[in-house]
Interface confidence: medium
């Protein structure tokens, strides 16, 4: 929005809400909001919550969204966890421990079950919980190969801390790899990183779900909290709209939420989704800090203007030189929603839902 | 711009152009045009060329700028470019010849003549020219520390080819953190990456610079082919006016070029410096493609429209949700440009200047 | 309006001197290089000598080296070309004219001023 | 020093007619190559600048191209103000050099 005029801001508010009912249930691909008749009493299961509270963790790491997004992107993605098999598998036995190395196995058919197109997989993301780690650990990530070999992924720099972390890895590519292949066991190895002149080097670094002298087998306690992969897919059923590409993007709320700002700015708007929208199916969150953008971006920049008193407004008002500046979000955050479809909850993730701060553009 | 009027097209160009004319000297922060007065008959010396060319390398490497830039990075960085020190130098005995290093030193003093204060860097790559590889390479960059050891940086897997390729390393941090400190040479070391596992892994990739018997001394031949240190900093004169962070951020042009489309959509405007804004004073390039957005965005939601009208338009006309969405820039480019300051050619790299693509936002 | 006024051209004996003056107008004088072009009676033009804004800068045709200097003074936004050594083939009109830009093309120029190299 | 040869060294021709001028350069000189007009007893007016770029207030009836030695000042559509002599001028490298001169009379 761009306009000096005097604005009517419950209007603008209003006019946002409803614009949000038609995002969500557009993201969604859903025509009217879904029947709530099967959805079972009490609380949501402890497993879609743990779900969900990944996703959001994930949202936090992230904090904005920076990465313009094809077509495919802007709808929900469906979040899924697939824990890796566990330790004491046979297939385990087929890899020697070793001082440098842990290995991790998952099983293909609950990756296809979760995702049966690999063209539907969005992010595929290895998540591991790292225990407490007394010294600065380098490690790297590998993929079983085919005749058991290893490929190099990616690396990780490690720093000594008391309290345990999840580590994340993309490997979207990997996970769509074996989802196109008709292998039964698919695998990571973390080893420590090994230069060409010191190759003695440990892996120090403790990963929940191993069994160990040193802790027991947290495996067992923790079966939770093993390493898992983290899915975010388009719904088969959803698949078939999506077209080539078309896209998206966008960045703070400190300065406008604390000024009494005029010109282009975040404002405040919270969305509670029974009182603003009527809406009582989305079983998690209870709303969200939705936000718009609002206030004018004037065109400053004229032949008869004085050069030297429009340069300092210009990275304000008009950084990217348009005819007509307009003030529009510039950081989008995604938002993680749980609710039903007849008896099953869902966890899905909607893209660029909370305006985090706006630009003239 | 969102409107659906009849639009007079040559009045948004001017518009445009006029903005633009702002935008540039804005970024630089120059009241008007610099005077010419200094500026020395005949082309840019060779040495201009080249840092113009490696930016615009760079740009073409990176294409999109999809990270929203804290304000700082609104403004034009001043490019350099530090040679590696050459290979006959003393320093390099130090450091035994091995079949899975090279060592690259570079002088602080030259990195502090360029950027004087760590905190005006923007970003340093490391450039390195890749000749001709016969086999895939697992290659791994470390920085010298203290007492001669060497820390981790990165990683690139290198695709065997038959043409030669320039590799880019993101070094901002080292060079900031040598900007900080005393020493006088610093350097970086490329190796092949060697697992715990299998040790004998030779540097089989040929980087331009270094005598080996197999090519003769192509440090010589190809001097400023040699390994450098890209550098992108903000001008000392201009650092006092920033202040600490306001964003900007955003993405295609084929289809909108190719079609008739009536709604918001990247349009083409390519400015001339000279004829289009009478000015003789950047060198390089002689002008560019700016683009510009333009096209209705309409509001299609309301309580009475059916709903499972408007679901389809929503990714099209008003993925954010906004209580007025508004057709503006999503992917930006940046713009290099050389002009003189006195008697002095600057290169610099202007953010956000190409409109890619446009949404409604 | 930016305008541009030789003078102090006339008739000189060869191995004497002269001194042109090129006064400027309309147009911040210290922003611009500014140059001495002459053309001989029935013939084409000849570029003889450039200026930096500053005047830290000169530039002279090999024909003059040595014998033409060129100044300004931007505070009288004035610029010169001192002659000395004239010889018969320096006949002609000169022109100052405005350097515009680092191209090198001259934009604005005055009117001319004859110098005569006889005995 | 760079020469610049410009060819014709004079031509007639009547109101209407389109008329090239041709400036040729001793070596590779880019496009540092600017265009005058010249009319007796005056002073030179700058047409064309960097080989191809209109100067402002010239009629769009001049244009100017080439890169490197061989340039071309074209007029689409003679005017009677038109008749002068036309000049190049190379600032690729001092000495900056000026063409011979192209005389454009009335047939």
């Known amino acids: 929005l761009s306009t000096s005029k005097t604005i009517d801001m419950e209007l603008v508010k209003r006019k946002r809400i409803e614009a949000i009912r038609g995002q969500i249930l557009s993201k969604l691909r859903l025509a009217s909001p879904p029947s709530q008749g099967e959805v079972p009493p009490g609380p949501l299961p402890e497993a879609v919550l743990a779900l969900y509270n990944s996703t959001r963790d994930r949202v936090a790491g992230e904090s904005a969204e920076p990465e313009p997004e094809p077509e495919a992107d802007y709808y929900a993605k469906e979040v899924t966890r697939v824990l890796m098999v566990e330790t004491h598998n046979e297939i385990y036995d087929k890899f020697k421990q070793s001082t440098h190395s842990i290995y991790m196995f998952f099983n293909t058919s609950e990756l296809r079950e979760a995702v049966p197109e690999p063209v539907l997989l969005s992010r595929a993301e290895l998540r591991l919980l790292r225990l407490k780690l007394k010294v600065e650990q380098h490690v790297e990530l590998y993929q079983k190969y085919s005749n058991n070999s290893w490929r190099y992924l990616s690396n990780r720099l490690l720093a000594p801390s008391d309290s345990p972390e999840w580590l994340s890895f993309d490997v979207t590519g990997v996970v769509r790899q074996w989802l196109s292949r008709g292998g039964e066991i698919e695998g990571f190895r973390l080893s420590a990183h090994c230069s060409c002149d010191s190759r003695d080097n440990t892996l120090q670094v403790d990963i929940n779900g191993f069994t160990t002298g040193r802790r027991g087998d947290l495996a067992t306690i923790h079966g939770m909290n093993r390493p898992f992969l983290l899915l975010m897919a388009t719904p088969l059923e959803r698949a078939q709209h999506l077209q080539s590409s078309r896209h998206r993007a966008a960045l703070d709320t400190n300065y406008c939420f604390s000024s009494t700002e005029k010109n282009c700015c975040v404002r405040q708007l919270y969305i509670d989704f029974r009182k603003d929208l009527g809406w009582k199916w989305i079983h998690e969150p209870k709303g969200y800090h939705a936000n718009f953008c609002l206030g004018p971006c004037p065109y400053i920049w004229s032949l008869d203007t004085q050069y030297s008193k429009v340069l300092a407004l210009y990275n304000q008002h008009n950084p990217g030189a348009s005819a007509a500046p307009c003030c529009v979000p510039q950081a989008l955050e995604p938002l993680p929603i749980v609710y039903y479809v007849g008896r099953k909850p869902k966890v899905e993730q909607l893209s660029n839902m909370i305006v985090r701060s706006c630009k003239c553009s | 711009l969102s409107t659906s009027k009849t639009i007079d097209m040559e009045l948004v160009k001017r518009k445009r152009i006029e903005a633009i004319r702002g935008q540039i000297l804005s970024k630089l922060r120059l009241a008007s045009p610099p005077s010419q007065g200094e500026v020395p008959p005949g082309p840019l010396p060779e040495a201009v060329l080249a840092l113009y060319n490696s930016t615009r390398d760079r740009v073409a490497g990176e294409s999109a700028e999809p990270e929203p830039e804290p304000e700082a990075d609104y403004y034009a960085k001043e490019v350099t470019r530090v040679l590696m020190v050459e290979t006959h130098n003393e320093i390099y005995d130090k450091f035994k010849q091995s079949t899975h290093s090279i060592y690259m030193f570079f002088n602080t003093s030259e990195l502090r003549e360029a950027v004087p204060e760590p905190v005006l860097l923007s970003r340093a790559e490391l450039r390195l020219l890749r000749l001709k590889l016969k086999v895939e390479q697992h290659v791994e960059l470390y920085q010298k520390y203290s007492n001669n050891s060497w820390r981790y940086l990165s990683n690139r897997l290198l695709a065997p080819s038959d043409s030669p390729e320039w590799l880019s390393f993101d070094v901002t941090g080292v060079v900031r953190q040598w900007l900080s400190r005393g020493g006088e040479i610093e350097g970086f070391r490329l190796s092949a990456h060697c697992s715990c596992d299998s040790r004998d892994n030779t540097l089989q990739v040929d980087i331009n610079g270094f005598t080996t018997g197999r090519r003769g001394d192509l440090a010589t031949i190809h001097g400023m082919n040699r390994p450098f240190l890209l550098l992108m900093a903000t001008p000392l004169e201009r650092a006092q006016h920033l202040q600490s962070s306001r964003h900007r951020a955003a993405l295609d042009t084929n289809y909108c070029f190719s079609s008739t489309e009536k709604n918001c959509c990247v349009r083409q405007l390519y400015i001339d410096f000279r004829k289009d804004l009478g000015w003789k004073w950047i060198h390089e390039p002689k002008g560019y493609h700016a683009n510009f957005c333009l096209g209705p965005c309409p509001y299609i939601w309301s309580l009475d429209t059916q709903y499972s009208k408007v679901l389809a338009l929503y990714n099209q006309h008003n993925p954010g949700a906004s209580a007025a969405p508004c057709c503006v820039p999503q992917a930006l480019e940046p713009l290099p440009i050389v002009y003189y300051v006195g008697r002095k050619p600057k290169v610099e790299q202007l953010s956000n200047m190409i409109v890619r693509s446009c949404k409604c936002s | 309006e930016v305008q541009l006024l030789e003078s102090g051209g006339g008739l000189v004996q060869p191995g004497g001197s002269l001194r042109l003056s090129c006064a400027a107008s309309?147009?911040?004088?210290?922003?611009?290089?500014m140059t001495w072009v002459r053309q001989a009676p029935g013939k084409g033009l000849e570029w003889v000598s450039a200026?930096?804004?500053?005047?830290?800068?000169?530039y002279f045709a090999d024909s003059v080296k040595g014998r033409f200097t060129i100044s300004r003074d931007n505070s009288k936004n004035t610029l010169y070309l001192q002659m000395n050594s004239l010889r018969a083939e320096d006949t002609a009109v000169y022109y100052c004219?405005?350097?515009?830009?680092?191209?090198?093309?001259?934009?604005?120029w005055g009117q001319g001023t004859l110098v005569t190299v006889s005995s | 020093d760079i020469q610049l040869t410009q060819s014709p060294s004079s031509l007639s021709a009547s109101v209407g007619d389109r008329v090239t001028i041709t400036c040729r350069a001793s070596?590779?000189?880019?496009?540092?190559l600017n265009w005058y007009q010249q009319k007796p007893g005056k002073a030179p007016k700058l047409l064309i600048y960097?080989?191809?770029n209109l100067q402002s207030g010239v009629p769009s009836r001049f244009s100017g191209s080439g890169s490197g030695t061989d340039f071309t000042l074209t007029i689409s559509s003679l005017q009677p103000e038109d008749f002068a002599t036309y000049y190049c001028?190379?600032?690729?490298?001092?000495?900056?050099?000026f063409g011979g001169g192209t005389k454009v009379e009335i047939k």
């Open positions: 070596q590779s000189i880019s496009s540092y």
């Open positions: 001028q190379q600032t690729y490298t001092v000495p900056l050099t």
């Open positions: 200026i930096s804004g500053s005047g830290a800068a000169t």
């Open positions: 309309g147009f911040t004088f210290a922003d611009y290089a």
């Open positions: 004219a405005r350097v515009s830009s680092g191209h090198w093309d001259f934009d604005y």
């Open positions: 960097a080989a191809s």
